[in-house]
Amino acid sequence: DAEFRHDSGYEVHHQKLVFFAEDVGSNKGAIIGLMVGGVV
């Protein structure tokens, strides 16, 4: 997980999420996305 500190003083956590293509369609392989986990 990457962590980024902004000028506001808050930390925003980003998390890589991986899904299998067959769960959301008919292809093989993995789909990788980025989720902003929120402000801590």
């Epitope: 998390q15 299998f20 067959e22 959301v24 093989k28």
Partner: nanobody, 124 residues
């Protein structure tokens, strides 16, 4: 209720191999996405890898890519974790886990079924 039972752990020399098994009962095996996690002493439980429901797709953490292989046998309702070229840092309790279709495969909270864990110790 779905139950997961791991086996195959033990003590192995660095550079050696080990195969873990996870027997699944009490549910429809083909509808459960399976993954492996591990937890070393004093550390958080971390994702190792996962296999799709069909068995056609796999995904691995960078730390084990090229050394570990996950497979599943629908006839035996079993998932396997083949671990090769083991290193000291692979020492951990290994957990088999199951998740509903459509959930992220690499995060703990996706998984609602967990085995009891099996200890793997790599000795140099």
């Amino acid at each position: 209720e779905v139950q997961l039972v791991e086996s195959g752990g033990g003590l192995v020399q660095a550079g050696g191999s080990l195969r873990l098994s996870c027997a699944v009962s009490g549910g429809t095996f083909s509808s459960i996405g399976m993954g492996w996690f591990r937890q070393a002493p004093g550390k958080e439980r971390e994702f190792v890898g996962a296999i799709s429901r069909s068995g056609d797709s796999t995904y691995y953490a960078d730390s084990v890519k090229g050394r570990f292989t996950i497979s599943r046998d629908g006839a035996k309702n079993t998932v396997y974790l083949q671990m090769n070229s083991l290193k000291d840092e692979d020492t951990a309790v290994y957990y088999c886990a199951g998740r509903p279709a459509g959930t992220a495969i690499n995060i703990r909270r996706s998984y609602n079924y967990w085995g009891q864990g099996t200890q793997v110790t790599v000795s140099s």
